[in-house]
Amino acid sequence: MAVTACQGLGFVVSLIGIAGIIAATCMDQWSTQDLYNNPVTAVFNYQGLWRSCVRESSGFTECRGYFTLLGLPAMLQAVRALMIVGIVLGAIGLLVSIFALKCIRIGSMEDSAKANMTLTSGIMFIVSGLCAIAGVSVFANMLVTNFWMSTANMYTGMGGMVQTVQTRYTFGAALFVGWVAGGLTLIGGVMMCIACRGLAPEETNYKAVSYHASGHSVAYKPGGFKASTGFGSNTKNKKIYDGGARTEDEVQSYPSKHDYV
């Protein structure tokens, strides 16, 4: 019961996490900027992984997509890649984990197969979460190191003077969504891995010994006693007593140190 709950909770937490990663990747507010050296003060800029937007106090908002691939900063491309890998891995993990859920019966799928699938999905969720956290952290680092406070450097350009706009770059909402979502996916993956341990059958066989009694033939077949997991050929966990009606070869067992007690 605890295993099913852990697995189910892990699935739900991962599902929420992956939904969050997708949301963060699509959001425009990865970086927000106040262009405060402008005479028109109420101008607010924000950028995402896919487009840049400008919003004004008048209500006017305009967004433009980054239509070029080659010209964009390498860091931005790396963040995009990390987020997409995270989403793809997470989506595959979700698909695998649906079939791995203990509460869902699919044909005659054994618990060992479900355990393997649970572990696989758990690992996928962990990697997915790490990708998202890494992507968001790389972007945040890019903001902090390069742009946190651009100074007003003046230099001569071809058409006159160029100056870096004094801009305060702040973390956008998408960064926080990404961090939380990555963390949830990671936690969900860990829970799936924990659930996998509980699902895995214990393969502890107590080797049965064959005795040769002088009277009627009674054989204890190997595998007669098995740990109470319900696996193996003898699912009832009973001793198997066979009567004497058997062939000469069948009664004959290989010599062992117990044969001549």
Epitope: L35, V43, Q47, V54, M142, S150, T164, V165
Partner: nanobody
């Protein structure tokens, strides 16, 4: 490389009109605020008028009601219609644009043109 090229300046009589235009060219991703500033001989550069992408405008008190700023976002061009010109409007008029480049849409720059001279004299 980005260039701002002003045009339309010249000699005009008091009470006359002029229309300045400034075209931005180069690897521009988005121009945010565009504006006009002026610098009279021996004076500091001062704001004349600015306009945002959404056409919100701001004017210097000395030009309100006489000057009109407009822009064409598609052409990356800003215009300044100057009416009822006075001798004190005589200055070098500079075009200004806050923009980001296609190669780095996360960093904003202020570009300035080389200026166009407007002389109001009889």
């Amino acid at each position: 490389q980005v260039q701002l090229v002003e045009s339309g300046g010249g000699l005009v009589q008091p009470g006359g009109s002029l229309r300045l235009s400034c075209a931005a060219s180069g690897s521009i991703f988005m121009i945010n605020v565009m504006g006009w500033y002026r610098q009279a001989p021996g004076k500091q550069r001062e704001l004349v008028a600015v306009i945002t992408r959404g056409a919100s405008t701001n004017y210097a008190d000395s030009v309100k009601g006489r000057f009109t700023i407009s822009r064409d976002n598609a052409k990356n061009t800003v215009y300044l219609q100057m009416n009822s010109l006075k001798p004190e409007d005589t200055a070098v008029y500079y075009c200004n644009a806050d923009l980001n480049l296609a190669s780095d849409p996360f960093k904003w720059y202020t570009y300035w043109g080389q200026g166009t001279l407007v002389t109001v004299s009889s």
